[in-house]
Interface confidence: low
């Protein structure tokens, strides 16, 4: 507000009166001035701040015929439908020459039935879980006493005797309604009625029961659901991308989750069609007729490795005298884990099989015993992961090497005199 000067020659001859009434009241405040010369514009202040959008009218009447004679100015401020925001100290302000003059103040007050500043809101709560409801009302006149009602039944013997602004509810087992009454000397006002919907508690102890490469069996403990039986539980699984960053309490997964519904009881579910050796995050929520519980936190789980689902591909075995060159390609079928290497077995018609671990190489040169006269030599290859061997390839007979056929140099592997491994199932 501008600086004011309360000089002796204040132009004000009438100051705003006081208005006190109930909400919705209409009233008028007036200021009267006597000024010499051109009359000024009258501004209204509320609590020292200029009212930019005041509903004011100004009437000015000259007391003589000369412009330099005195004028009487009356400014009226109309307050329509009195609200709390209208209350305060009202003054008129005028600029005259280089001086600012401010009227004596008038006050606008409110008095009537209690007015709610805050009312109980609809909300959902978990069964048997404490929560608070808020209700706040004011006059004037003060004091304002509150009386809470649950399902239309008062929670105290009289207004002001029970909880006031905040009602602590230790827990509900059924959906209920709450309201509050505000009492003052002028009467009673009733708040809106809030519906508190009782949902199941968040399930607890979500855990893995068993793991297979493409399925996980999970179980959980249901929370209380009040008088409403659980109808089903919903499990979500989402692939855990390393950069995905699902936090313990993150509300939504970053991609569309795999959602499964479980009839309850039992509180257990087998999640199938998963990728082997893959990290997932899972969570569960349970639903009653009133609605779903909150989700559990995301639980990190992982499917175990499986064995490769197919044998190595495109196996070729070529013989040149006492050497045999074998090479192959990685299985086209899913590996179901991290490929650790290949096993190779070869066997002649009347000789014991020889088993070798080749590691991750995809080719090997075998140094055959003797002059290489072993007949009907066949080779089989299998890929393996930490979970074990995948299926062996069909036996591939060694073909004689023909001139012009490429024979790259490879590390030679001497055939041991006895089988390197014993594979009873071979």
């Amino acid at each position: 507000a501008p600086r004011g000067t309360q000089a002796e020659e204040s132009p004000f001859v009438g100051n705003p009166g006081n208005i006190t009434g109930a909400r919705g009241l209409t009233g008028t405040l007036r200021c009267q001035l006597q000024v010499q010369g051109e009359p000024p514009e009258v501004h209204w202040l509320r609590d020292g701040q200029i009212l930019e959008l005041a509903d004011s009218t100004q009437t000015q009447v000259p007391l003589g015929e000369d412009e330099q004679d005195d004028w009487i100015v009356v400014s009226q401020l109309r307050i329509t439908s009195l609200q709390l925001s209208d209350t305060g100290q009202y003054q008129c302000l005028v600029f005259l020459g280089h001086q600012t003059f401010v009227s004596q103040p008038g006050y606008v007050g409110l008095e009537g039935l209690p007015y709610f500043l805050e009312e109980p809101e609809d909300r959902t709560v978990a069964a048997n879980t404490p929560f608070n409801l808020s209700c706040q009302a004011q006059g004037p006149p003060e004091p304002v006493d509150l009386l809470w009602l649950q399902d239309a039944v008062p929670l105290a013997t009289a207004p002001g005797h029970g909880p006031q602004r905040s009602l602590h509810v230790p827990g509900l087992n059924k959906t209920s309604s709450f309201s509050c009454e505000a009492h003052n000397a002028k009467g009673v006002t009733t708040s809106r009625t809030a519906t508190i919907t009782v949902l199941p508690q968040q399930p607890r102890n979500l855990h893995l029961v068993s793991r297979q490469p493409t399925e996980l069996e999970v179980a959980w403990t249901p929370g209380l659901s009040g008088i409403y039986p659980l109808t089903h539980c919903t499990l979500q699984a989402v692939l855990s991308d390393d950069g995905m960053g699902i936090q313990a309490g993150e509300p939504d997964p970053p991609e569309e989750p795999l959602t499964s519904q479980a009839s309850v009881p039992p509180h257990q579910l087998r999640l199938g069609s998963l990728h082997p050796h893959t990290p997932y995050h899972i969570r569960v929520a349970c639903t009653s007729s009133q609605g779903p519980s909150s989700w559990t936190h995301w639980l990190p789980v992982e499917t175990p490795e499986g064995v490769p689902l197919g044998p190595p591909e495109n196996i070729s075995a070529t013989r040149n005298g006492s050497q045999a060159f074998v090479h192959w390609q990685e299985p086209r079928a899913p590996l179901q884990g991290t490929l650790l290497g290949y096993r190779l077995a070869y066997q002649g018609q009347d000789t014991p099989e020889v088993l070798m671990d080749i590691g991750l190489r995809q080719e090997v040169t075998l140094e055959l015993q003797g002059d290489g006269s072993v007949s009907n030599l066949t080779v089989c290859v299998a890929a393996y992961t930490a979970a074990g061997d995948g299926p062996w390839s069909l036996p591939v007979p060694l073909e004689a090497w023909r001139p012009g056929q490429a024979q790259p140099v490879h590390q030679l592997v001497k055939e041991p005199s006895t089988p390197a491994f014993s594979w009873p199932w071979w």
Epitope: A1, R3, G4, Q6, G48, T100
Partner: antibody
Amino acid sequence: EVQLVQSGAEVKKPGATVKISCKVSGYSFTGHTMNWIRQPPGKGLEWIGLIKPSNGGTSYNQKFKGRVTISADKSISTAYLQWSSLKASDTAMYYCAHGHYESYFAMDYWGQGTLVTVSS
Amino acid sequence: DIQMTQSPSSLSASVGDRVTITCKASQDNSSAVAWYQQKPGQAPRLLIYWASTRHTGVPSRFSGSGSGTEFTLTISSLQPDDFATYYCQEHFSTPLTFGQGTKVEIK
């Protein structure tokens, strides 16, 4: 409930710099102003400056300008007063105070005070 | 800058007395005057602003008045809890200035 909680007492040597904090709760931190006032032992109140956290705008008492920096971190609802080139005469209780919504220059809620002692 | 001159610097009074403290502004400030109460070891507490508006929770025995450059804080009936130091402050424009304080002591 409106609360302004200030950092603990500080003992500094002349020429040093001190930074004290004022964490607010119970109201919108960015709504009004935060004033800083000091009171030497047994003496009156002296306004240092203010900040409007919503835009970082500051106003300082010219007497202290150059040695004082007022700042605010909206994310943690905290205002700071940094005072450099401390002198023994800067020994005082330093208060943060919230500007009243009807006049930002009237102070309705105050911190408990931070005693800064400057001594060699 | 608006200077605030407060008087008296101290006064002795008894419980039930009417106490008046005055503050004079060096220039008019549109009634932008606040009054604070401070007890030893405590932060100041706002009593009055805009010269006469009581802050929330302040007992009605505290009242402010004045306009132009002369402002008064009145305690209509002094209570034991009212023995403290009182400060006026102009809150019209920066730099904000305080009066020197008035210490109200038990007679």
